[in-house]
Interface confidence: low
C-alpha cells in the first residue's frame, strides 16, 4: 500500500542513519551575541545521517521519493534527514525597554525523519 | 534576530536551488500496479535542488543549521530541500469489495523549503 511501514533499523551500521545529535554552539557562533543575553551557549539538537531506502519515511511522499531515487538517481534526490518535531526553547534577549524572555518553538529539533 | 529573513533569490544560478519539479512516474515505477487502478501515470511534484546559506529557510532551526554548517561542515549538514506543503491526490484502487476512491494528503508536494 501507499503506507508501507517505514524501516527503523539502519542498514548502514550504527549511527550512520538519520538521527538526532547534539551540537554545541555559542551565541557568537550563531551571530546572536548582540541581542541574546542568555543562555551563553546552546546545546542544539539537530538531525543528521543518511536516509537509505524507506528508513524512517516521513510520509507517502518520502516513500515514493525513495523508490524513484532508486530508479532515477540523477533526477530524484534521496530523502533527507530533517526534524519531525521541535522542543521549545526560552531565550532571554534585549529589547528597547530592557530584557524579555521569549519562547522559540522551532529552534531545537526533538525528533527526526526522512522527507 | 532569530528570525532573519530567508533569502529567496538563488545565488547558484537558475534552477540550481531548492524548487518544485514534476517527475513523471507510472504505477509500475511505484510498485502500485497491483492495487491502484487509476491514474495509470502520475505527475509527481517533488522538491529538488540545493540549499545555499539562508535560501528559503523553513524556520529558525534551518537558519541555525545553515550557519553552523558554514562553521562546521563536517559535523553539521547543510539544510536540504523538502516539501513545505502538499496537494491532495485521489487514487482509485482495488478493495475486497470492488474499487474505491481514496484521497492521499501527503503524496504530491505543493511547495518546498530548506529544512
Amino acid at each position: 500500500s501507499a503506507h508501507a511501514h517505514p524501516r527503523d533499523s539502519c542498514p548502514l551500521g550504527p549511527g550512520r542513519c538519520c538521527h538526532l545529535e547534539t551540537v554545541q554552539a555559542t551565541l557568537e557562533d550563531l551571530g546572536w551575541s548582540d541581542w541574546v543575553l542568555s543562555p551563553r551557549q546552546l546545546q542544539l539538537s539537530m538531525c543528521v545521517g543518511e536516509c537509505p531506502h524507506l528508513y524512517r519515511s516521513a510520509n507517502t511522499h518520502a516513500q515514493i521519493k525513495a523508490r524513484l531515487h532508486g530508479l532515477q538517481p540523477d533526477k530524484v534526490p534521496a530523502p533527507c534527514c530533517v526534524p519531525s518535531s521541535y522542543t521549545p526553547v526560552v531565550l532571554m534577549h534585549r529589547t528597547d525597554s530592557g530584557v524579555s524572555l521569549q519562547t522559540y518553538d522551532d529552534l531545537v529539533a526533538r525528533g527526526c525523519h526522512c522527507a | 534576530s532569530a528570525h532573519a529573513h530567508p533569502r529567496d533569490s538563488c545565488p547558484l544560478g537558475p534552477g540550481r536551488c531548492c524548487h518544485l519539479e514534476t517527475v513523471q512516474a507510472t504505477l509500475e515505477d511505484l510498485g502500485w500496479s497491483d492495487w491502484v487502478l487509476s491514474p495509470r501515470q502520475l505527475q509527481l511534484s517533488m522538491c529538488v535542488g540545493e540549499c545555499p546559506h539562508l535560501y528559503r529557510s523553513a524556520n529558525t532551526h534551518a537558519q541555525i543549521k545553515a550557519r553552523l554548517h558554514g562553521l562546521q561542515p563536517d559535523k553539521v549538514p547543510a539544510p536540504c530541500c523538502v516539501p513545505s506543503s502538499y496537494t491532495p491526490v485521489v487514487l482509485m484502487h482495488r478493495t475486497d469489495s470492488g474499487v474505491s476512491l481514496q484521497t492521499y494528503d501527503d503524496l504530491v508536494a505543493r511547495g518546498c523549503h530548506c529544512a
Epitope: 538521527h19 551540537v23 546552546l42 | 559535523k75
Partner: antibody, heavy 119, light 107 residues
Framework: QVQLVQSGAEVKKPGASVKVSCKAS????????INWVRQAPGQGLEWMGW????????NYAQKLQGRVTMTTDTSTSTAYMELRSLRSDDTAVYYC????????????WGQGTMVTVSS | DIQLTQSPSSVSASVGDRVTITCRAS??????LAWYQQKPGKAPKLLIY???SLQSGVPSRFSGSGSGTDFTLTISSLQPEDFATYYC?????????FGGGTKVEIK
C-alpha cells in the same frame, strides 16, 4: 530504563593516571552529552567538564585543563574520563552524568567511582 | 566564572515544616538554574530544571522560583525522605558551577 554504569573503585599513587568509564544504556547515546562531576570527601559538587557524544566537542574546567581528557566510544555507548598527574586532593567520588540538555541540567547520573590517591 | 551562593548552609527542621533554600548568582542566569538533592553515599538527583520546572517523578511539594540572580527552592511540607543536602547549579555558561550546598537536618 536510562542508566549510566561506571567502572569500579581505584587506588592510585601520586603522579599516576586514572581512567574511569561510564557505559550508557536505555537512550540514544549520541543525542546527549556527558558531564563529569567530582565530589571530594565531605565536600560539595565540582564540575570537571562536558563532552558531546556525537562530535567529541569538549569543554573542561579551567583548573583541570591539561590534566583531564574526556572521550567517547559511540560503538559501545561508553564515555571515558582520564585524569593525569594525580595528587592527593584528586581523591573524590567521580560521577558521569547525562546532559546537558538545552538547560544543561543533568537528569541521569552514574553511581559514582571512588578514586583514592595515596602514597 | 559565575559564582553561586547558597543559604543557609544548613537548616534544622521537622517533618511537616516548610523549608526554603536560596541561591544567588554573581550575574544574571535566568532561567538556567537547576536544583539537586543528594543523600549520603548516593548520586545527586535532579529536582527542578529551568528555575521552576519540576522534573518528572519528583513530588509536587518541591517547587522552584526566581529569576535573574535570585532563586529559591521550597519544600512545602518536609517529609522524612527529604532530609538530605541540596545543591543549585547554573547552566547559563561554561564552566557549569554548583552552589556550596544546603544540608537539611532533623530538628
Amino acid at each position: 530504563q536510562v542508566q549510566l554504569v561506571q567502572s569500579g573503585a581505584e587506588v592510585k599513587k601520586p603522579g599516576a593516571s586514572v581512567k574511569v568509564s561510564c557505559k550508557a544504556s536505555g537512550y540514544t547515546f549520541t543525542s546527549y552529552g556527558i558531564n563529569w562531576v567530582r565530589q571530594a570527601p565531605g565536600q560539595g559538587l565540582e564540575w570537571m567538564g562536558w563532552i558531546t557524544a556525537y562530535s567529541g566537542d569538549t569543554n573542561y574546567a579551567q583548573k583541570l585543563q591539561g590534566r583531564v581528557t574526556m572521550t567517547t566510544d559511540t560503538s559501545t555507548s561508553t564515555a571515558y574520563m582520564e585524569l593525569r598527574s594525580l595528587r592527593s586532593d584528586d581523591t573524590a567520588v567521580y560521577y558521569c552524568a547525562r546532559g546537558p540538555g538545552q538547560y544543561a541540567d543533568v537528569d541521569v547520573w552514574g553511581q559514582g567511582t571512588m578514586v583514592t590517591v595515596s602514597s | 566564572d559565575i559564582q553561586l551562593t547558597q543559604s543557609p548552609s544548613s537548616v534544622s527542621a521537622s517533618v511537616g515544616d516548610r523549608v526554603t533554600i536560596t541561591c544567588r548568582a554573581s550575574q544574571g542566569i535566568s532561567p538556567w538554574l537547576a536544583w539537586y538533592q543528594q543523600k549520603p553515599g548516593k548520586a545527586p538527583k535532579l529536582l527542578i530544571y529551568a528555575a521552576s520546572s519540576l522534573q518528572s517523578g519528583v513530588p509536587s511539594r518541591f517547587s522552584g522560583s526566581g529569576s535573574g540572580t535570585d532563586f529559591t527552592l521550597t519544600i512545602s511540607s518536609l517529609q522524612p525522605e527529604d532530609f538530605a543536602t541540596y545543591y543549585c547549579q547554573q547552566a547559563n555558561s561554561f564552566p557549569i558551577t554548583f552552589g556550596g550546598g544546603t544540608k537539611v537536618e532533623i530538628k
